[in-house]
Amino acid sequence: AILGRSETQECLFFNANWEKDRTNQTGVEPCYGDKDKRRHCFATWKNISGSIEIVKQGCWLDDINCYDRTDCVEKKDSPEVYFCCCEGNMCNEKFSYFPEMEVTQPTSNPVTPKPP
């Protein structure tokens, strides 16, 4: 392991479409692959009238946008589908929306998924 880097070996897995896809709805997904590539966790979700609906969670491929992010945070302003990625085992268990705004002070909106 490289000093100061969180290696991702497993992520929380979730699939909202699990019945149709014939997968587990939730679980732990091992992240493996090329030794020279970094691995990350991700989460995607929607905000339907203030209610959080998780779409997918799992392992994400080597992505510089995820490097050294210990927390899973979406920074885009009001996307239709929220996305975040992070490094570290199960770092996608919790995710949050923290939009980067130009003028106003950003406010954190942490999201803790409720168990199904």
Partner: antibody, heavy 120, light 107 residues
């Protein structure tokens, strides 16, 4: 070196059947989801079907659902596509492709393809 | 199914030109967008995944951007070997779909 080699293509009459095979080497086959993608002559790419590494989860395009069956034999490192009730519009080059481990699941290695012609 | 619309369907350009290809999804697909290059008679080759991440071994003149519904593939300085057809693909939905392709031809 990752290699994917398709076989089994050929000329078949409408309503007929064909089974395509894809022999994989150079990687741990069971770790990877595999897919079939086709390309009709002079047309674009069309995803056909995918199967998880264990073979337990399968996915199909609506255009082939109920007619095509994807499967794999992990002991032989081989992917299959059983095609039944073939139609003229199924005429295409069929590519076997390996899916990356982890989202967004790009197809990182492709075979050279096998041509399926459905004609009377 | 999610529809992927590429534009233009074809373009003519010269070596050294900056080329931009766009791909639009019929609904938000976050960053679940991949780009492929295909040369005549050959299998497609992965260029970019996750909307912006360059696949290993792909020259840095290729870049991708976008999220949600609008995506762009840019070739900063077109080389002779870049004349090919380019396809976007969404993997957000289990029913994967490709764009119709953009053929990049020599002017």
């Amino acid at each position: 070196e990752v290699q994917l080699l398709e076989s089994g293509g050929g000329l078949v009459q409408p309503g007929g059947s064909l089974r395509l095979s894809c022999a994989a080497s150079g990687f741990t086959f069971t770790d990877y989801a595999m897919s079939w993608v086709r390309q009709a002559p002079g047309k674009g790419l069309e995803w056909v079907s995918s199967v998880s590494g264990s073979g337990s989860s399968t996915y199909y395009a609506d255009s082939v659902k109920g007619r095509f069956t994807i499967s794999r034999d992990n002991s032989k490192n081989t992917l299959y596509l059983q095609m039944n009730s073939l139609r003229a519009e199924d005429t295409a080059v069929y590519y076997c492709a390996r899916g990356s481990i982890g989202a967004p699941w790009p197809l990182d290695y492709w075979g050279q393809g096998t041509l399926v012609t459905v004609s009377s | 199914d999610i529809q992927m619309t590429q534009s233009p369907s074809s373009l003519s350009a010269s070596v050294g030109d900056r080329v931009t290809i766009t791909c639009r999804a019929s609904q938000s697909i976050s960053r679940f967008l991949n780009w492929y290059q295909q040369k005549p008679g050959k299998a497609p080759k992965l260029l970019i995944y996750g909307a912006s991440i360059l696949q290993g071994g792909v020259p840095s003149r290729f870049s991708g951007s976008g999220s949600g519904t609008d995506f762009t593939l840019t070739i900063s300085s077109l080389q002779p070997e870049d004349f090919a057809t380019y396809y976007c693909q969404q993997t957000y939905s289990t029913q994967w779909t490709f764009g119709g392709g953009t053929k990049v031809e020599i002017k």
